[in-house]
Amino acid sequence: QTSVSPSKVILPRGGSVLVTCSTSCDQPKLLGIETPLPKKELLLPGNNRKVYELSNVQEDSQPMCYSNCPDGQSTAKTFLTVYWTPERVELAPLPSWQPVGKNLTLRCQVEGGAPRANLTVVLLRGEKELKREPAVGEPAEVTTTVLVRRDHHGANFSCRTELDLRPQGLELFENTSAPYQLQTFVLPATPPQLVSPRVLEVDTQGTVVCSLDGLFPVSEAQVHLALGDQRLNPTVTYGNDSFSAKASVSVTAEDEGTQRLTCAVILGNQSQETLQTVTIYSFPAPNVILTKPEVSEGTEVTVKCEAHPRAKVTLNGVPAQPLGPRAQLLLKATPEDNGRSFSCSATLEVAGQLIHKNQTRELRVLYGPRLDERDCPGNWTWPENSQQTPMCQAWGNPLPELKCLKDGTFPLPIGESVTVTRDLEGTYLCRARSTQGEVTRKVTVNVLSPRYE
């Protein structure tokens, strides 16, 4: 009778085991072990027992002890069970960003591991078990579907294998995959709202605002604002589930024409974009041209108003005839025209919007000098010893210099308060002089003496 010890062994893969083959007869003709495993016999006294060291056990095996005794041949098998933890425990790769409301399929693949009867695959969210299944197939695959929720944001999903050898007197061996961190997001189907000027003048600045509500997590949203090829650098303000990106846009003559303004919001692996056109225009203020800004009285003056070729102008409120970018008027300069404003108003339609510009010029009319009865009376009669202010106003542009002299030497104090004396009496020659010429006027002062009774 042949026996083997131990009859059952569980050992780690690549491990070694001592197997004892025994026989019940004292003088067996043969006693040995049959196995494909590398073996080494340990020398022992006696003929009816042999010990073998079996090494590098890679898979389950059933070495067989045999003996040949006088009463016949017999065999006994030992059962070697190899255990090893899986070589690969992996979650199938997934995009880290997943939209809320999507059904997400988690797939765990397990390669290797034995004994399979003791191997279980567990899918987890954090520490919460989602699914537990025995490992079947090579590679073993376990799947589960998760409906992505907002509160799953940042959750770690993992896959764990459990090789439970506790019933065999060993421990529970666990292997865990690298975690998959889920980033959940909500990007609404509505495109971002873009508020910007429809038209923008060259060498000016405009403000562009792009905003969107209903985002999650809003802090992860990327905003790209651009005008044509010019990337704008917005200041982004975040709300609970909204953002507002504000940027200044400067345009130059090179940008003139219709440009595309874009606002793109990227969140997770999705994006929403809004496009708008902005018309960049150049519109210098209209030109008011006077033949001469300063003319003498009686001179013919042409006032011209010129604007952008597509503009429509009015000159002093009168539309150009025909309607267009030029208007003019002719006038003979009079003193009343001195300081007169000529205003040219231009309207330019840019992409349906009306832009208004204005320019004003003043005409200077040189005239005079003038001395007339109204402003310089020819006769004054004043009581002696009274307080009087001689008044004589000369008119003209430029303002004339005025002197009133009696006998060429004695001045009349114009505009000053004086006590009337006999010396003041007489005829004065008032002379008004400017670059435009000279006029004279005689002014007589009569002094009334008081009557003594």
Epitope: R198, V199, T277, R310, K312, V313, T314, L315, N316, G317, V318, P319, P322, L323, S343, C344, S345, T347, E349, A351, G352, Q353, L354, H356, N358
Partner: antibody
Amino acid sequence: QSVEESGGRLVTPGTPLTLTCTVSGFSLSDYYMSWVRQAPGKGLEWIGIISDSGSTYYASWAKGRFTISKTSSTTVDLKITSPTTEDTATYFCARDWSYDSSSGYYYYDMDLWGPGTLVTVSA
Amino acid sequence: AYDMTQTPASVEVAVGGTVTIKCQASQSINSWLSWFHQKPGQPPKRLIYKASTLASGVSSRFKGSGSGTQFTLTISGVESADAATYYCQQGYSRSDGEHVFGGGTEVVVK
């Protein structure tokens, strides 16, 4: 000075229709002209405008559905490219250009309207 | 875009009373605003232009005011002939996609 629309009639959906606006007493080379419509019992709805130089602008809902063109110095057309029952309305043509003598600026203002022409779209 | 919001949508007023209609622009339109009224079967008729200037032949009972974004039309001493739908219209822009008219206010005279 006057404005008058013509061409309104009963059409089947999808049949293109052209309305004409005829002006007298002024020239279209000096004015912008707008088309406005009004569905039965509804408010005024601006369709689009044509400038003195022939540039056109449209309301967002009207783009691609309507075409405004100048056919002479006294006529402007509105083409409804593929009418639907929703296009049933009275269509008005209005002079849409004014200037303010105090500032000297031009602005949009519908100061002169036609009596309107009725378009009925029905199968 | 220049959105024009008109309030109220409808108002009832007794003969001799006063009615106020408001029009709000989403962006400044300076004073480029006109008011119209329209009676059934007729084209609109301009009452006021440049926010406050009375169109020729229009009764001085109609008064327009405001600038920028807020505008008001006031009808005082209401007559039965004033029963109509009133519209505001911005004169600042006719860009693509623009809103030109307010939604309208129906004035019912009792």
